[in-house]
């Protein structure tokens, strides 16, 4: 489709690097999260840092190109790195508007991210929305 992808945009204070130039920041008003309209892909990403049972958003935005995983409709994070003992970075890529705003679950850090694994959970009928 010709329409450009719109993603949630967030960069935690102190995070290294920026993906701000991969899209155009939108004025979305106070009731919506900060949004970015992608320039070079139709793909959103999210990065969360899981420490013990607490997940903290690190970055959300546009990817610089369409790659495997971008065809996903939802954000299904998988473990990517261990920046420090006891913490794990989880990332997702997905290809619908604002799909990087939330996740349904995080697999435990020690697992390969199998569908049955469960991490910090949202309450029934509710997703974990990252309030920006």
């Amino acid at each position: 489709p010709p329409n450009r992808r719109t993603c949630v945009f967030f960069e935690a204070p102190g995070v290294q690097g920026s993906t701000k130039t991969l899209g155009e920041l939108l004025d979305t008003g106070p009731e919506l999260p900060r949004a970015i309209r992608c320039l070079y892909s139709r793909c959103c990403f999210g990065i969360w840092n899981l420490t013990q049972d607490r997940a903290q958003v690190e970055m959300q935005g546009c990817r610089d190109s369409d790659e495997p995983g971008c065809e996903s409709l939802h954000c299904d994070p998988s473990p990517r790195a261990h920046p420090s003992p006891g913490s794990t970075l989880f990332t997702c890529s997905c290809g619908t508007d604002f799909c990087n705003a939330n996740y349904s679950h995080l697999p435990p850090p020690g697992s390969p991210g199998t569908p049955g694994s469960q991490g910090p959970q949202a309450a029934p009928g509710e997703s974990i929305w990252m309030a920006l």
């Epitope: 130039t21 919506l32 309209r37 190109s65």
Partner: antibody, heavy 117, light 111 residues
Framework: QLQLQESGPGLVKPSETLSLTCTVS?????????WNWIRQPPGKGLEWIGY???????SYNPSLKSRVTISVDTSKNQFSLKLSSVTAADTAVYYC??????????WGQGTLVTVSS | EIVLTQSPGTLSLSPGERATLSCSAS??????????MHWYQQKPGQAPRLLIY???SLESGIPDRFSGSGSGTDFTLTISRLEPEDFAVYYC?????????FGGGTKVEIK
């Protein structure tokens, strides 16, 4: 001061391939932004051909996609346009331009390419 | 693709007068309330020059007699008081959807 300069043959024969190069000075094309080709037939309006981004992502106008290739030579800070199977309808002034986000803030001066036998 | 129609085709005015140029899109060029319409000026033998981006933001170095407005499908470029150097062709461009498209242009000529 960022400058863009188009270069290439001013005359191309029908059915051949049009090849143009844009040399960028004052900014590294691998640092940021997208680098575009836009054309303007004599006395007519503007048509966006396509871009290559600083990271290598490419987008083409669907109306020309089957005939267009845009590439980059990072060592020379240049990007290039190839348009195959040209006809008289491809006669135009060809511009290279930088897009800051999705609008064009720096342009080359343009080069006229005539398709004729 | 989105088709942009500019009107009038030619505008005949005198220096000091106000110019109002219109650009109508075949479908909305807004994303979540943000308008992706831009305006350029082109003089004979020269490349286009960016004047206005995102409907109403004035490009750096452009005189403030130029202003843009509009949303959705209808946009306007206004030149509050025409200076001799403003007589040129003006193009609108949308970037809400691929491919980027331009209007056919409005020529502002000296009356």
């Amino acid at each position: 001061q960022l400058q863009l300069q188009e270069s290439g043959p001013g005359l191309v024969k029908p059915s051949e391939t049009l090849s143009l190069t844009c040399t960028v000075s004052g900014y590294s094309i691998t640092s940021d932004y997208a680098w575009n080709w836009i054309r303007q037939p004599p006395g007519k309006g503007l048509e966006w051909i396509g871009y290559i981004s600083y990271s290598g992502s490419i987008s083409y106008n669907p109306s020309l996609k089957s005939r267009v290739t845009i590439s980059v030579d990072t060592s020379k800070n240049q990007f290039s346009l190839k348009l195959s199977s040209v006809t008289a309808a491809d006669t135009a002034v060809y511009y290279c331009a930088r897009s800051r986000y999705s609008w064009f803030d720096y342009w080359g001066q343009g080069t006229l390419v005539t398709v004729s036998s | 693709e989105i088709v942009l129609t500019q009107s009038p085709g030619t505008l005949s005015l005198s220096p000091g007068e106000r110019a109002t140029l219109s650009c109508s899109a075949s479908e909305s060029v807004d994303t979540y309330g943000n308008s992706f319409m831009h305006w350029y000026q082109q003089k004979p033998g020269q490349a286009p020059r960016l004047l206005i981006y995102r409907a109403s933001s004035l490009e750096s170095g452009i005189p403030d007699r130029f202003s843009g407005s509009g949303s959705g499908t209808d946009f306007t470029l206004t030149i509050s008081r025409l200076e001799p150097e403003d007589f040129a062709v003006y193009y609108c461009q949308q970037s809400n959807e691929d491919p980027y498209t331009f209007g056919g242009g409005t020529k502002v000529e000296i009356k």
